[in-house]
């Protein structure tokens, strides 16, 4: 459920990787949703320390992204998904190994908390970028 | 349609305080910042600050801090700007802007003409 | 705070090219936007995120922004585009919004 609000990104966390002046929506299912979802994302991002350099910054692009979706113009804030061809690129072909890894301890309960799951996209159920170009965000 | 409607001129003393209105309408109000820029006469703009109608936030430019108060009414989809300790240098016409979903003020109102005179 | 800097005049003749700079410190980092004020009138926002057009703006007007000087270009300067142009940028590190000193453009 997209409830929620646009405004700049003012993060430390994704402001290299997000686009310049990012307008980013802020899920207000979070009591305070700026500092839920950079939190979310420092949470992720700390374990994404010990990846593979070729893994890293793929994984820190689609991260912050996902977490800290663009804003799509018009008068009900809406968020823009990451394209699926894009999500698809990071699990398949950057980050194969490290995917495989974060799946089977998902599947073991090897994670302490949630929070690491609402870091990581379903590729499968993004929009893909051939459907309506507009519909999503490529990193 | 997408429209920002502001309330009408106003004369005040020195000393006195002004209440702009802003009434949104043909969008998500709480989806979006509502920033007030101001513009003297003959002057350029000046931005005074901005309100998260969603949660009540406010960020005021260092101008006018301690002068400034914004707050937004969700309930009629309506921002307001007030002016405390008003000088003759705060004659201005006073705009209410907001960006629906990008980053620049892509909507603003028609404009609040407030004269300070004695 | 962030200062940007506009020539206050710029004339050109109509059918010509009409370019109005604004400098900034390092201005290419952050997004530029412009405004187009007439007289009487509320601005209009002619070019976002340092060359987007908004819907009905016509492509005659483009933007360009990089080092230290973001550029608003006109071409085919119609009588119509007599006007305050302004640029504008969000200061990252205040927080705050910041326009430029504006420049006026004159159609000979």
């Known amino acids: 459920d997209n409830k929620g609000y646009c405004a700049q990104y003012r993060g430390e966390v994704c402001n290299a990787v997000l686009a310049k002046d990012a307008l980013v929506f802020l899920n207000t299912s979070y009591a305070d949703p700026e500092e839920a979802q950079e939190l979310l994302v420092h949470t992720a991002w700390n374990e994404l320390k010990v990846v593979s350099p070729v893994c890293r910054p793929a994984a820190e692009a689609l991260l912050c992204n996902h977490i800290f979706q663009e804003c799509s113009p018009g008068v009900v804030p809406t968020p823009i998904p990451i394209c699926r061809e894009y999500c698809l690129a990071v699990k398949e072909l950057f980050c194969a190994k490290e995917w495989l890894v974060m799946e089977e301890k998902t599947h073991r309960g090897l994670y302490r908390s949630e929070m690491h799951l609402l870091s990581v996209p379903e590729c499968s159920k993004l929009p893909s970028m051939h459907w309506d170009p507009t519909a999503c965000a490529r990193l | 349609q997408v429209q920002l409607v502001q309330s009408g001129a106003e004369v005040k003393k020195p000393g006195a305080s002004v209440k702009v209105s802003c009434k949104a309408s043909?969008?998500?109000?709480?989806?979006?910042?509502m920033h007030w820029v101001r513009q003297a006469p003959g002057q350029g703009l000046e931005w005074m600050g901005w309100?998260?109608?969603?949660?009540?936030?406010?960020n005021y430019a260092q101008k006018f801090q301690g002068r400034v108060t914004m707050t937004r009414d969700t309930s009629i989809s309506t921002a307001y700007m007030e002016l405390t300790r008003l000088r003759s240098d705060d004659t201005a016409v006073y705009y209410c802007a907001s960006g629906l979903g990008i980053s620049a003020f892509d909507i603003w109102g028609q404009g609040t003409m407030v004269t300070v005179s004695s | 705070s962030y200062v940007l800097t506009q020539p206050p005049s710029v004339s050109v003749a109509p059918g010509q090219t009409a370019r109005i700079t604004c400098g900034g410190n390092?201005?290419?980092?952050?997004?530029v936007h412009w405004y187009q004020q007439k007289p009487g009138q509320a601005p209009v926002l002619v070019v976002y995120?340092?060359?987007d057009r908004p819907s009905g703006i016509p492509e005659r007007f483009s933007g360009s922004n990089s080092g230290n000087t973001a550029t608003l270009t006109i071409s085919r300067v119609e009588a119509g585009d007599e006007a305050d142009y302004y640029c504008?940028?969000?200061?990252?590190?205040?927080?705050?919004?910041?326009f430029g000193t504006g420049t006026k453009v004159t159609v000979l």
């Open positions: 390092n201005i290419g980092s952050k997004s």
């Open positions: 995120d340092d060359s």
């Open positions: 504008q940028v969000w200061d990252r590190s205040s927080d705050h919004y910041v």
């Open positions: 043909g969008y998500t109000f709480t989806g979006y910042y």
């Open positions: 309100i998260n109608p969603n949660s009540g936030g406010t």
